[in-house]
């Protein structure tokens, strides 16, 4: 039961984490204009991985996509790549972990196969989380560097009375979403790996069970394989149940072979 709970919780935490990574990647507020010196501004700039925006004091917001690929900073490209890799790995991990969930019956899948799938998805979640954390951290580092550079050159004199005030950018909401989401995905992955250890059967003990069927004799073999007297032998429309031996943790319900809890 504890294994099922750990696996289920790991899945849910990872699911929330990956949803957060996707949200962070799509968000426009990776960096926002620093308002330390001027808390009320007529034009508020903020930037994402895919476009940059301005919110005017008039209430209007306008965004411009980065329509160039080669002209973008290498660091931004790297962050994009890390976030996308994180999302892809996370999505595959989710897909794998759905089939690995102990509470879902997929045909006659053995526990060892589920354990392997759980471990695989766990590793994928861990790598996905690390990618997201790395991506966000690289961007944050880039912001910090640029912040202090623009502070040093806050007013770059152009001679005479004209001056260009550089817009300084600080951490946006997406960075915090990304860090938290990456952390959750990482934690979910670790939980899946822990659950994998409990899933892996150390030794398989089959209990000998004797079944007595009235009328036709039906032989039951452990392992989920069904033997009957022949194609037309079930004349009284009796159900022939898949009576393979089960571990104590498993619950069987009929007639569906896909048991969604």
């Amino acid at each position: 039961m504890a294994v099922t709970a750990c696996q289920g919780l790991g899945f849910v935490v990872s699911l929330i984490g990956i949803a957060g990574i996707i949200a962070a990647t799509c968000m426009d507020q990776w960096s926002t204009q620093d308002l330390y010196n001027n808390p009320v501004t007529a034009v508020f700039n903020y930037q994402g991985l895919w476009r940059s925006c301005v919110r005017e004091s008039s209430g209007f917001t306008e965004c411009r996509g980065y329509f160039t690929l080669l002209g973008l900073p290498a660091m931004l490209q790297a962050v994009r790549a890390l976030m996308i890799v994180g999302i892809v790995l996370g999505a595959i991990g989710l897909l794998v972990s759905i089939f690995a969930l102990k509470c879902i019956r997929i045909g006659s899948m053995e526990d060892s196969a589920k354990a392997n799938m759980t471990l695989t998805s766990g590793i994928m979640f861990i790598v996905s989380g690390l990618c997201a954390i790395a991506g966000v951290s690289v961007f944050a580092n880039m912001l910090v560097t640029n912040f202090w550079m623009s502070t040093a050159n806050m007013y770059t004199g152009m001679g005479g009375m004209v001056q260009t005030v550089q817009t300084r950018y600080t951490f946006g909401a997406a960075l915090f979403v990304g860090w938290v989401a990456g952390g959750l995905t990482l934690i979910g992955g670790v939980m899946m790996c822990i659950a994998c250890r409990g899933l892996a059967p150390e030794e398989t003990n089959y209990k000998a069970v004797s079944y007595h069927a009235s009328g036709h004799s039906v032989a039951y073999k452990p392992g989920g394989f069904k033997a009957s007297t022949g194609f037309g032998s079930n004349t009284k429309n009796k159900k022939i149940y898949d009576g393979g031996a089960r571990t104590e943790d498993e619950v069987q319900s009929y007639p569906s072979k896909h048991d969604y809890v």
């Epitope: 204009q33 001027n38 009320v40 501004t41 007529a42 034009v43 508020f44 700039n45 903020y46 930037q47 940059s52 925006c53 301005v54 005017e56 004091s57 008039s58 209430g59 209007f60 306008e62 965004c63 411009r64 004209v162 001056q163 260009t164 005030v165 817009t167």
Partner: antibody, heavy 118, light 113 residues
């Protein structure tokens, strides 16, 4: 069509106060900021401040922080500007204007002449 | 505060000729987020409120004749009237919409020669 209709001309004594109104129609009142701009006789334009009708949030030119108070009555779609401690240099035409994209002022009231004279 | 300086103070142009008014800002009006310049041009005729001509430095407001055009970026901006008409006699103002407080140029008076 969009209209901003201002109250009539006022003559005030120095030290007195005056409240100028600006009634908006033809658009969703609570969606746009309303500005106040003044123009002294034969002079240029000077921005006083702006108010957002939905939450009465204001942005005020620091030069006018002790002079102007901007308020809103959403039930009548009216914006008010109260000028206190009037002096002769406050004699001007006061305009209200709606804020449009680009922080530009697209629709203007006809103006209210406030004359401060002893 | 951003200081807006217009030149010339007054301008006399013959009908059908081109008129050019310049506006210099003490600070860049270019927003990095959308690469727009927050500069606005107004026309004010005697006894009337100002009328919006151009915003974002080059975007004409609806109903403004296409003889009016705006250009420039950063700190240096220009309003051009390609073929001056009699009804264009007015005072023209530029305005900073980039930072509070919004500030206006001192105005340029356009007259017919």
């Amino acid at each position: 069509q969009v209209q901003l209709v201002q109250s009539g001309a006022e003559v005030k004594k120095p030290g007195a106060s005056v409240k100028v109104s600006c009634k908006a129609s033809g658009y969703t009142f609570t969606n746009y900021w309303v500005n106040w701009v003044r123009q002294a006789p034969g002079q240029g334009l000077e921005w006083i401040g702006m108010v957002h009708p939905s939450g009465s949030e204001t942005r005020l030119n620091q030069q006018f922080k002790d002079k102007a108070t901007l308020t809103v009555d959403t039930s009548t779609s009216t914006v008010y500007m109260e000028l206190s401690s009037l002096r002769s240099e406050d004699t001007a035409v006061y305009y209200c204007a709606r804020v449009w994209s680009g922080n530009a002022f697209d629709y203007w009231g006809q103006g209210t002449l406030v004359t401060v004279s002893s | 505060d951003i200081v807006m300086t217009q030149s010339p103070d007054s301008l006399a142009v013959s009908l059908g000729e081109r008129a050019t008014i310049n506006c210099l800002s003490s600070q860049s009006l270019l927003a990095s987020g959308n690469q727009r310049n927050y500069l606005t041009w107004y026309q004010q005729k005697p006894g009337q409120p100002p009328k919006l001509l151009i915003y974002w430095a080059s975007t004409r407001d609806s109903g403004v004749p296409d003889r009016f055009s705006g250009s420039g970026s950063g700190v240096d901006f220009t309003l051009t009237i390609s073929s001056v008409q009699a009804e264009d006699v007015a005072v023209y103002y530029c305005q900073n919409g980039f930072s509070f407080p919004f500030t206006f140029g001192q105005g340029t008076k356009l007259e017919i020669k």
